[in-house]
Interface confidence: low
């Protein structure tokens, strides 16, 4: 049942040992009790004991104290279990009867075997506290106490809330005095079925099947499932949502594995040359004077370009080159002549003409000869 009405008989006094009719019991009043619990009636009347009935064996003769039976067997206090919401009101009839023999059934007793009958009614809230009462008639006195308590797993003001503590797949909770659930540590939700994940575990990207756990949903990683997993094979990129591959600066391609900044990452140009990116994995080196090659790795000999004129010979130097001019010539490239037409500088029949700017003369060569002095034969 949802609750139990408990009646504790404490003392019955019948000093003269008489029945309700006034007739004495022979040899004494062997007293037992019948209890009837029913719904509230303004005037308690006969009829079915709608909340239950209970009777006792013979408890004593005439006047006696009733021993408390704390074994819980339902003997004293008497137990009247009920299986409904306690209404908060009741009627109670307690009859004391004389048992001339061993048969205590109503039909086996003479009608005048009644010693006394009390009837009370009123309000009674569920609670642990006993209500003490004493009812006195001209001949008898009965002292007793009563209360209503909830059965195991029933709670609330009317014992109407069923709550059974549990710690399994269907819930992890204990019951509060009002019947509400109180979740065990690490659990939440209406029936405490939902585990509380590791503190900080991402609400959307993480989940858990037991407290303090953080399991990641597909595409997420990290202790708190707040780091996305980039596209498989992403080399130089990151993600803001799973399976993305957003390239770092200087990288391109689907997997961010194509170098767009070869100059910075590899410094391919040598000897102080200037590097320019010109596409994926391509670059151009602009060499300083004196250097050549794709990466300006080759040092040039400046004499290779035959800078010395008029038969001057070229010599490489650390900072460039030097022309050794033949007699009659001078200048950086032996371009200036100290000769004039009077010195007959033109060979092979070349004709000499005086000049004013730069050189002092110029040779006009016959066919098949060239050079500033017609000194070279053209094959």
């Amino acid at each position: 049942g949802s609750g139990v009405f408990q009646l504790q008989l404490q003392e019955f006094i019948n000093e003269r040992g008489v029945l309700a009719s006034g007739r004495p019991c022979e040899p004494g009043c062997r007293t037992f009790f019948r209890v009837c619990l029913k719904h509230f009636q303004a005037v308690v009347s006969p009829g079915p004991c709608t909340f239950g009935t209970v009777s006792t064996p013979v408890l004593g003769t005439n006047s006696f104290a009733v021993r408390d039976d704390s074994s819980g067997g339902g003997r004293n206090p008497l137990q009247l279990p009920f299986n409904f919401t306690w209404p908060g009101t009741f009627s109670l009839i307690i009859e004391a009867w004389h048992a001339p023999g061993d048969d205590l059934r109503p039909e086996a007793l003479p009608p005048d075997a009644l010693i006394s009958k009390i009837a009370i009614q009123g309000s009674l809230a569920v609670g642990q506290n006993w209500l003490l009462d004493e009812q006195t008639s001209t001949l008898t006195r009965l002292r007793y106490s009563y209360r209503v308590i909830c059965s195991d797993n029933y709670y609330g003001d009317n014992c109407s809330r069923l709550c059974k503590k549990r710690n399994d797949h269907f819930g992890h909770y204990v019951c509060q005095p009002d019947g509400n659930l109180s979740c065990l540590p690490g659990w939440t939700g209406e029936y405490c079925q939902q585990p509380i994940c590791l503190s900080g575990c991402h609400e959307q990207n993480g989940y858990c099947s037991k407290p303090a756990e953080c399991l990641c949903r597909p595409g997420w990683q990290g202790r708190l499932c707040n780091e996305c997993i980039p596209h498989n094979g992403c080399r130089h990129g990151t993600c803001s949502t799973p399976w993305q591959c957003t390239c770092d600066e200087g990288w391109g391609g689907l997997f961010c594995d194509q170098d767009l900044n070869y100059c910075t990452h590899h410094s391919p140009c040598k000897n102080g040359a200037t590097c320019s990116n010109s596409g994926q994995r391509s670059y151009t080196c602009t060499c300083r004077p004196g250097y050549t090659g794709v990466d300006c790795e080759l040092e040039l000999s400046e004499c290779d370009s035959n800078p010395c004129r008029n038969g001057g010979s070229c010599k490489d130097q650390e900072d460039g080159y030097h022309c050794l001019c033949p007699p009659g010539y001078y200048g950086l490239h032996c371009e200036h002549s100290t000769l004039s037409c009077a010195d007959s500088p033109c060979f092979n029949g070349g004709s000499c003409r005086e000049r004013n700017q730069g050189a002092n003369y110029a040779c006009e060569c016959p066919p098949n000869f060239t050079g500033s002095n017609c000194e070279k034969k053209v094959d």
Epitope: T53, V54, P57, G74
Partner: antibody, heavy 118, light 107 residues
Framework: EVQLVESGGGLVQPGGSLRLSCAAS????????ISWVRQAPGKGLEWVGL????????DYADSVKGRFTISADTSKNTAYLQMNSLRAEDTAVYYC???????????WGQGTLVTVSS | DIQMTQSPSSLSASVGDRVTITCRAS??????VAWYQQKPGKAPKLLIY???FLYSGVPSRFSGSGSGTDFTLTISSLQPEDFATYYC?????????FGQGTKVEIK
Amino acid sequence: EVQLVESGGGLVQPGGSLRLSCAASGFTFTDNWISWVRQAPGKGLEWVGLINPQSGSSDYADSVKGRFTISADTSKNTAYLQMNSLRAEDTAVYYCARDNFGGYFDYWGQGTLVTVSS
Amino acid sequence: DIQMTQSPSSLSASVGDRVTITCRASQDVSTAVAWYQQKPGKAPKLLIYSASFLYSGVPSRFSGSGSGTDFTLTISSLQPEDFATYYCQQSYTGQSTFGQGTKVEIK
């Protein structure tokens, strides 16, 4: 003299319905509860359910809950057992009994046989 | 539901024997136990109520005892008319339950 007389038993097909009656006499019908108890052939006694004729409140064994309904007509001093969705395992002799002060059965009817078979 | 377990399920005895039948409840039922006698083709008859009280008209050779979970029906001197099946019943809860019965046969 206290008397309880059942009627209404018979053969019914599985899934069918039947209503049993229990006519009471010789005592105040509204001051007692009436219980129905059944006994399958060669088996023991099984409490089926009860009714408080005065209030109409009733209770049932788990095995029949939702299928059987107990009612009472106080003007006729008669209790009824309405049996629906009958099964082969409901085959039994059905007794009504007076459920006296303390919950024991001091008077019984003679019983009526219900056979559920196709 | 409270289960009532009776033992033995059957026994053979002779007229004049003392016979004891026991009934064990699956939980405490105070003294809310009754005993019944049933003969073939007949309705059960009440023998004992409230564990130990003899019902009106029942011979005094029948007696009952016990409280809590263990109960006993004793027939002090078996008579020919006592050969029958005996059932215990608990009425501690609204959902009354019976034991499975003990058949007392002639030896």
